[in-house]
Interface confidence: medium
C-alpha cells in the first residue's frame, strides 16, 4: 500500500545498528531524574528482630540484601529491564497519568540453609529457595 | 545444648504447622492496609501514541497490562510472593524505616508478533519476548 | 545523535505571548516524542509539555489553557504557544527529544536529548 512504501521510504533515512534493548541503555548519565537509579542494598535480617528465634537454631540472621531505586527514563543497561518494563518506561515517561513506572524488584535470587524445629520439635536442616537478593532490574 | 533444649520446649508451645516463610501468609483479610492489593491492570499500548507508527507496520497496538497494588503485610497467597518478598515484608511490618515493601511486579510475561521495516526497509516479523503481562506478585 | 536547536525566547511583559521553536537535526526521524521542560531560578526542571510523534499532547497543570505545543514532523520542528504569561513563567526553557526502537534482538529506547535552553523572562 501507499501508507506502507510511504513509511518504508522515511524508514530508510534511521541511522544503522541501533541495537535492541541496549538502545535504551545509551543515555547512561542522563539528568532526566535526580533520584538513584535501582540497585542492591544492603540488609541483614535477624531471626531474632523477626521474632523467629524460638525456632529458627542456626543461623541467627543472613544477609538478605534489598532491591530500591528509580526506573526512569532512560534505562540503562544494567538495570536488567524486561521489554514490557522498557515499553512501560517509555508510556509513563510520555504521559505520567498512564501508568506507574516499573518497579525495582529482584532479578536474581539464591537460597540459605536454616536449622530449624519442626512442630514435633525434631531438628530439621533445609534449603530455602529465594531468600537473599543477588541482582535487582526494572519490572 | 541447655539453649537449644530450651528453645525446643518453647517451640513446642507454639502453635502447630507454622511451616516456615508461609507463616507471614496467614492472616489472608486482614485490614491492615486499605489500598489496593497488587494486581494486573488493563493498558493498551498504541504505537502511534509512542511514535513508532512509522516503522511498525502490524499491530497498531497491544494490550500489554500492567502491575499495581500494594505489597503489604500479610501477604495474601494469591500475590506469588517470593520468599524474599515475604521476609521483606515482615522486616517493613516490624520496622518501616528499614526498607521499603517489596514492590508489585510481573510474574508472567508472553510474548507477540510485531510486523515491522528494519534499517534497509525490509519487512521483518519477528516474535518479542516479555511483552505481555500475564500475572503480577510481590517481589 | 541528535542535535537540538531552541529559539523564540525573550523578554515580555505579563500578558504577553511567545512562541519557542525547536528544531531537530541529525538522527531525527527516530524521535518518538518531543516536549518542553523549564527550570525557575533556584528550581528543579519540570516538564511543561510534551508531544509524541502521533499527536498524543500533556501539559503541566500550570500551563493548561494559556500554553500549547504543536510538532511539523516534516520539519522535525516542535512549536511552544505561550499565551497569557506570568511572572511565575519566567524560566529556562529547555527542548528535549525521545529516541527510540525496535530491532531484530529486541526492544528498547535509545534515550533523551536535551537543548542548550531559551531564556523566557516574564516581567509584571
Known amino acids: 500500500s501507499t501508507g506502507s512504501k510511504q513509511r518504508s521510504q522515511n524508514r530508510s533515512k534511521t541511522p544503522k545498528n541501533q541495537e535492541a534493548l541496549r538502545m535504551a541503555n545509551v543515555a547512561e548519565n542522563s539528568s532526566s531524574d535526580q533520584r538513584q537509579a535501582c540497585k542492591k542494598h544492603e540488609l541483614y535480617v535477624s531471626f531474632r528482630d523477626l521474632g523467629w528465634q524460638d525456632w529458627i537454631i542456626a543461623p541467627e540472621g543472613y544477609a538478605a540484601y534489598y532491591c530500591e531505586g528509580e526506573c526512569a527514563f532512560p534505562l540503562n543497561s544494567y538495570m536488567n529491564a524486561t521489554n514490557h518494563a522498557i515499553v512501560q518506561t517509555l508510556v509513563h515517561f510520555i504521559n505520567p497519568e498512564t501508568v506507574p513506572k516499573p518497579c525495582c524488584a529482584p532479578t536474581q535470587l539464591n537460597a540459605i540453609s536454616v536449622l530449624y524445629f519442626d512442630d514435633s520439635s525434631n531438628v530439621i536442616l533445609k534449603k530455602y529457595r529465594n531468600m537473599v537478593v543477588r541482582a535487582c532490574g526494572c519490572h | 545444648s541447655t539453649g537449644s533444649k530450651q528453645r525446643s520446649q518453647n517451640r513446642s508451645k507454639t502453635p502447630k504447622n507454622q511451616e516456615a516463610l508461609r507463616m507471614a501468609n496467614v492472616a489472608e483479610n486482614s485490614s491492615s492496609d486499605q489500598r489496593q492489593a497488587c494486581k494486573k491492570h488493563e493498558l493498551y499500548v498504541s504505537f502511534r501514541d509512542l511514535g513508532w507508527q512509522d516503522w511498525i507496520i502490524a499491530p497498531e497496538g497491544y494490550a500489554a497490562y500492567y502491575c499495581e497494588g500494594e505489597c503489604a503485610f500479610p501477604l495474601n497467597s494469591y500475590m506469588n510472593a517470593t520468599n524474599h518478598a515475604i521476609v521483606q515484608t515482615l522486616v517493613h511490618f516490624i520496622n518501616p524505616e528499614t526498607v521499603p515493601k517489596p514492590c508489585c511486579a510481573p510474574t508472567q510475561l508472553n510474548a507477540i508478533s510485531v510486523l515491522y521495516f528494519d534499517d534497509s526497509s525490509n519487512v521483518i516479523l519477528k516474535k518479542y519476548r516479555n511483552m505481555v503481562v500475564r500475572a503480577c506478585g510481590c517481589h | 545523535e541528535v542535535q537540538l536547536v531552541e529559539s523564540g525566547g525573550g523578554l515580555v511583559q505579563a500578558g504577553g505571548s511567545l512562541r519557542l521553536s525547536c528544531a531537530a537535526s541529525?538522527?531525527?526521524?527516530?524521535?518518538?516524542?518531543m516536549g518542553w521542560y523549564r527550570q525557575g531560578p533556584g528550581k528543579q526542571r519540570t516538564l511543561v509539555a510534551r508531544?509524541?510523534?502521533?499527536?498524543?499532547?500533556n501539559y503541566a497543570d500550570s500551563v493548561k489553557g494559556r500554553f500549547t505545543i504543536s510538532r511539523d514532523n516534516a520539519k522535525n520542528t516542535v512549536y511552544l504557544q505561550m499565551n497569557s504569561l506570568k511572572p511565575e513563567d519566567t524560566a529556562v526553557y529547555y527542548c528535549?527529544?525521545?529516541?527510540?526502537?525496535?530491532?531484530?534482538?529486541?526492544?528498547?529506547?535509545?534515550?533523551?536529548?536535551w537543548g542548550q535552553g531559551t531564556q523566557v523572562t516574564v516581567s509584571s
Open positions: 528535549y527529544a525521545v529516541h527510540s526502537k525496535l530491532s531484530t534482538t529486541g526492544w528498547g529506547t535509545i534515550g533523551d536529548y
Open positions: 541529525g538522527s531525527a526521524f527516530s524521535i518518538n516524542a
Open positions: 508531544i509524541t510523534s502521533g499527536g498524543s499532547t
